[in-house]
Amino acid sequence: MAVTACQGLGFVVSLIGIAGIIAATCMDQWSTQDLYNNPVTAVFNYQGLWRSCVRESSGFTECRGYFTLLGLPAMLQAVRALMIVGIVLGAIGLLVSIFALKCIRIGSMEDSAKANMTLTSGIMFIVSGLCAIAGVSVFANMLVTNFWMSTANMYTGMGGMVQTVQTRYTFGAALFVGWVAGGLTLIGGVMMCIACRGLAPEETNYKAVSYHASGHSVAYKPGGFKASTGFGSNTKNKKIYDGGARTEDEVQSYPSKHDYV
């Protein structure tokens, strides 16, 4: 039950995380105009991975796509790549994890196969989350560097008469969405990996066997013994946590008329 819950929760958390990564990647507000020096600007600039936008006080918003590929900064290209890799890995991970869910039965899929698929999806989610976090962090670092560079030459005076204010950019909402989403995907992946350990068919119970002593015959029922191998007649791999509990297909040995103590 705990394994199913962990796996299910891991799946849901990862799903939310990947949805967040997709949202962050599509969002236009990766960097927004810093309003510290001009809080009452009538023109507000913000930029995303795919286009830059200008929102005017009038209510008009104009967005222009980055129609060049070669003219874009290498860092921006790297961030795009990291986010796309994160989305692709996350999407594949989601697809794999759907089939790996313990609550979903697909044919006669072995628990070992589900465990492997859970582990695979977990690793994919972890890598996906790391890609998103890395992408967002690279962009944030780029912003910080540019921010201080533009602060250093904030005002370029023309004969000391005219001020040309350079637009500075700060962290946009997409960065925070990306960080949180990447973190959630990472957590979901870890949960899937933990669930995989619980799913792995490494704990098989021996069937109850009657041991007849030479003197007084007593039936010994070794309830909670575990086998370290995957072999044995109990193919259903049902776990026995309670020593006295029996699996459905367990053969019970009834005492014979000579077995009274």
Epitope: T41, A42, V43
Partner: antibody
Framework: EVKLVESGGGLVQPGGSLKLSCAAS????????MAWVRQAPRKGPEWVAF????????YYADTVTGRFTISRENAKNTLYLEMSSLRSEDTAMYYC???????????WGQGTLVTVSA | DIVMTQSPSSLTVTAGEKVTMSCKSS????????????LTWYQQKPGQPPKLLIY???TRESGVPDRFTGSGSGTDFTLTISSVQAEDLAVYYC?????????FGAGTKLELK
Amino acid sequence: EVKLVESGGGLVQPGGSLKLSCAASGFGFSDYGMAWVRQAPRKGPEWVAFISNSAYSIYYADTVTGRFTISRENAKNTLYLEMSSLRSEDTAMYYCARLGYGNSFAYWGQGTLVTVSA
Amino acid sequence: DIVMTQSPSSLTVTAGEKVTMSCKSSQSLLNSGNQKNYLTWYQQKPGQPPKLLIYWASTRESGVPDRFTGSGSGTDFTLTISSVQAEDLAVYYCQNDYSLPFTFGAGTKLELK
């Protein structure tokens, strides 16, 4: 056709109050930022106040801050300017304007005259 | 606040003449985000509200005759009327639309000789 009609102007004593209204029609009122611009006799236009389409952003000229209040009622397609503690220098023709591309005042009303005099 | 300085304050012209008026801002009106200059030109005739002529420094408002041309970038802007007509006699104002408060120039009055 875009139409802006101002009303509520008149003669008021210094220190008095007045509420101007601007009825808008012919466009999606809730989609545009609106402003009040005034023009004193034989002077150039002076921007007074601005309100964004959703009333999220509101700005005033330093000369009227604390005395004037701009508001809008999108359901009624109406813009308001509540003026208090009026001074003689507030005497002007008050125009209601709809913002357009480039934050320009694309459409203007015919104006309402406000006279502050003892 | 951005200060807008217009020159000359008045112009006396003859019909058909080419007219140029200047507007200077104390700060650049060029927005780096879209490379547009947030400067607007208005025409005001006596007893009427101002009328929008040009926005983004050079984009003509629909319905405005093509004899009106706006140019310039950053801090220096010009309004040119290629061939002045009698109906063009008015006061022309430039306005900063880049940063609040929106500020107007003192105007250039166009008069007939």
